[in-house]
């Protein structure tokens, strides 16, 4: 699987999850959350050549017909797989709330 | 939607789906297809800017950082949403066959 | 310049639903809290609650808890705020009002041009 | 919640007077230095425009004849000489508390 453990690890070229730390304040313009200032969301980058963890059926031939024909601009793209949420602490007036914010942190990217 | 009736009426630059047709023994040296002898398979092609079709709150969020960032390579990806099947005729012998192909072509996409 | 537009004035039955729509323009859309604060006729003003467009996080005055829902299209930068069970108390002009950010609760720096809704048999 | 109480409810003045409005929380709405406490003026058939947020800083584009001051429970909005365009009505508002609150509003007419 293209997963941190597997592409934090190594010097995969290909379609693999990378390192991304993103600051609520300074990248995103949100000052209202309290707790975390920031967090490690990951990004998903590289070719996706034929046979690299393709998706669907649509991605394996868009695959072939990439290496057929490879100055076209159709050919698959390395996205997100598996996301994790992440729990945040914001003030209602002076009183703490905690909420799980879904889907924002990528474990894992494929080809699609 | 980011679907064909939009796409394929407009000049979007963004995110969109695209037509692409694919030559079962040209495009991907598939012999044994009988018919279709090929396929509108589309493709998704397109800048995924900022609020445009973003699938889940990490690519909302991506995009978001991409707009504070402009020179970071890590950007939310046009790629396929819904996908529907083609049916193919191929002979196993003397004998044709029928069989329904899952996930083969694009008709809408989305920022993931 | 920031701008808030608001959906046109509304009558409607009691016990239906209304649903008023504040269009956000000149800001990103995604980085502020959007507040819904009402004003009966020649009363004060009355904070509904509150949405960031982002996330879909909600905070709700409890005195609408069940009966008010706050909805937010990003790709339009819209926000929507939806009031069910209406009664003829519910008459009022009702404002979207976009947080200075700081913190969820806060002051409103811009406010849209106001939706009156009128509930009357 | 907070109660937000406002006072006078009314008051008369004359162009160049010097207007202060006053608002006390029913408890402090201070929080680490901060008064969670704001000013809006609004006029007829108009939404509301934040004047002071924090208690005592002054919006942009709002003029400087508008300050803000207190902490605590007990907050005071100044005009120092009131403008024709002045004659509206005040508000203050609390954000120390979930829910926000108003005051009952104060309408400045003229003399």
């Known amino acids: 699987a293209l997963d941190t453990n597997y592409c934090f690890s190594s010097t995969e070229k290909n379609c693999c999850v990378r390192q991304l730390y993103i600051d609520f304040r300074k990248d995103l313009g949100w000052k209202w959350i309290h707790e975390p200032k920031g967090y490690h969301a990951n990004f998903c980058l590289g070719p996706c050549p034929y046979i690299w963890s393709l998706d669907t059926q649509y991605s394996k031939v868009l695959a072939l017909y990439n290496q057929h024909n490879p100055g076209a601009s159709a050919a698959p793209c390395c996205v997100p797989q598996a996301l994790e949420p992440l729990p945040i602490v914001y003030y209602v007036g002076r009183k703490p709330k905690v909420e799980q914010l879904s889907n924002m942190i990528v474990r894992s990217c494929k080809c699609s | 939607a980011l679907d064909t009736n939009y796409c394929f009426s407009s000049t979007e630059k963004n995110c969109c789906v695209r037509q692409l047709y694919i030559d079962f023994r040209k495009d991907l040296g598939w012999k044994w297809i009988h018919e279709p002898k090929g396929y509108h398979a589309n493709f998704c092609l397109g800048p995924c800017p900022y609020i445009w079709s973003l699938d889940t709150q990490y690519s909302k969020v991506l995009a978001l950082y991409n707009q504070h960032n402009p020179g970071a390579s890590a950007a939310p990806c046009c790629v396929p949403q819904a996908l529907e099947p083609l049916p193919i005729v191929y002979y196993v012998g003397r004998k044709p066959k029928v069989e329904q192909l899952s996930n083969m072509i694009v008709r809408s996409c989305k920022c993931s | 310049q920031v701008q808030l537009v608001q959906s046109g004035a509304e009558v409607k039955k009691p016990g239906a639903s209304v649903k008023v729509s504040c269009k956000a323009s000149g800001y990103t859309f995604t980085s502020y809290w959007m507040n819904w604060v009402r004003q009966a006729p020649g009363q004060g003003l009355e904070w509904m609650g509150q949405?960031?467009?982002?996330?879909?996080?909600?905070n709700y005055n409890e005195m609408f808890e069940g009966r008010v829902t706050m909805t937010t299209d990003t790709s339009t930068s819209t926000a929507y705020m939806e009031l069910r069970s209406l009664r003829s108390d519910d008459t009022a002009v009702y404002y979207c009002?976009?947080?200075?950010?700081?913190?969820?609760?806060?002051?409103?720096?811009?406010w849209g041009q106001g939706t009156l809704v009128t509930v009357s048999s | 919640d907070i109660q937000m109480t406002q006072s006078p409810s009314s008051l008369s003045a004359s162009v160049g007077d010097r207007v202060t409005i006053t608002c006390r929380a029913s408890?402090?709405?201070?929080?680490?230095?901060?008064?969670?406490m704001h000013w809006y003026q609004q006029k007829p058939g108009k939404a509301p425009k934040l004047l002071i947020y924090?208690?005592?800083n002054l919006e942009s584009g709002v003029p400087s004849r508008f300050s803000g001051s207190g902490s605590g429970t007990d907050f005071t909005l100044t005009i120092s000489s009131l403008q024709p365009e002045d004659f509206a009505t005040y508000y203050c508002q609390q954000n120390a508390e979930d829910p926000l609150t108003f005051g009952g509003g104060t309408k400045v007419e003229i003399k």
């Open positions: 924090y208690a005592s």
């Open positions: 408890e402090s709405v201070d929080w680490y230095g901060n008064s969670f």
């Open positions: 949405i960031f467009p982002a996330l879909g996080s909600t």
């Open positions: 009002a976009r947080g200075i950010g700081n913190y969820a609760l806060d002051a409103m720096d811009y």
